[in-house]
Amino acid sequence: TLNSVLNSNAIKNLPPPLGGAAGHPGSAVSAAPGILYPGGNKYQTIDNYQPYPCAEDEECGTDEYCASPTRGGDAGVQICLACRKRRKRCMRHAMCCPGNYCKNGICVSSDQNHFRGEIEETITESFGNDHSTLDGYSRRTTLSSKMYHTKGQEGSVCLRSSDCASGLCCARHFWSKICKPVLKEGQVCTKHRRKGSHGLEIFQRCYCGEGLSCRIQKDHHQASNSSRLHTCQRH
């Protein structure tokens, strides 16, 4: 997860990213039919709020990473965990919250001078289908011009929100993560009541923009829990 800096205060001061189910990304109101499980095209509803299992960091929200919940626990069982803040211990970039990266086992702030187009470092990361171990390896990473020489525009492949231009966040879209617009007032958002409840979604919405929060739409208060529509509203 090689990324540069958070681009603006508008991104920095936002509430935690909220994954979401498929709907028209730019529409003011859209349906949210549920979550799509990797390996299948069938939807399920999203009203059970236990921590979801995951196989990789990309299956978690932008403020989460995928790991075993207990240090000595079953390494084969992984769930989405809250990202590590600055100065916390880490093993790989994805463990650190947006705007930070993992350096020498500690989450440190990404700064403008850190990424210069081509870097060399050691990354500890899990990949492939075997998630029972964390494989440490060194690699020289060439940051593609498409992705990193300029901030990613809408639709650009990204790894973290800091790869994206102002007003965009990095959100999962099927097997990729791409830059999507931060949600505006009135747009549908997805409220997760417990961390990790969106680990299996493969279509994530961005979070609500500055000064907005994801709340139940007023005329939906009487609806059942499973069908209540959340939209971005002024604080």
Partner: antibody
């Protein structure tokens, strides 16, 4: 230069199996999702399967339970294991790299799979 | 599944002509629409992604427009090498689906 080179196609009987490979070069393979897309003779394009950089897999309903996509990031190679093959699986199979907007920005030259008795 | 409908299925044009191909999706797909060119015996080649963004190395005579359900690929001045089949593809929801193709032939 990005290159994708498929192999493993051929003639197989209905119910048989085949394993396709796609050797990738010119880019950091493990950072990209990869897909298989097929094209029956004289027909249009059909997405078959995809796999994320670290191994999460996705399938079209038409091949689910019969085809298995996988990748070996250490060998920069993508695979498609095709079992219980049917006549309607006859097609040129392309491997393709996932890019911006989840478009397929690079394609291999294709390998022909013929299922016939 | 989202159905992608291209029109026309084929057209005849001359070098220098302005050519327009349309693609319609069965439901809104925002800007998640890509265009490909395919020549006989060759692999498809990405032309336009995100409805209107020109892929690197693709001549500027190709352009894309549209959002929601209606999209257009335009070739401003047809060149001899442009005679091919063109496909649209949605990347908004799974399964990813392609249009049936538009064959551009020499008049």
């Amino acid at each position: 230069e990005v290159q994708l080179l498929e192999s493993g196609g051929g003639l197989v009987q209905p119910g048989g199996s085949l394993r396709l490979s796609c050797a990738a070069s010119g880019f950091n393979f493990r950072d990209y999702a990869m897909s298989w897309v097929r094209q029956a003779p004289g027909k249009g394009l059909e997405w078959v399967s995809a796999i994320s950089g670290r191994g999460s897999v996705y399938y079209a309903d038409s091949v689910k339970g019969r085809f298995t996509i996988s990748r070996d990031n250490s060998k920069n190679t993508l695979y498609l294991q095709m079992n219980s093959l049917r006549a309607e699986d006859t097609a040129v199979y392309y491997c393709a790299r996932g890019g911006d907007w989840v478009a397929f920005d690079y394609w291999g030259q294709g390998t022909l799979v013929t299922v016939s008795s | 599944d989202i159905q992608m409908t291209q029109s026309p299925s084929s057209l005849s044009a001359s070098v220098g002509d302005r050519v327009t191909i349309t693609c319609r999706s069965s439901q809104s797909i925002s800007n998640y629409l890509n265009w490909y060119q395919q020549k006989p015996g060759k692999a498809p080649k990405l032309l336009i992604y995100g409805a209107s963004r020109l892929e690197s190395g693709v001549p500027s005579r190709f352009s894309g427009s549209g959002s929601g359900t209606d999209f257009t690929l335009t070739i401003s001045s047809l060149q001899p090498e442009d005679f091919a089949t063109y496909y649209c593809q949605q990347s908004y929801s799974l399964p990813l689906t392609f249009g049936g193709g538009t064959k551009v032939e020499i008049k």
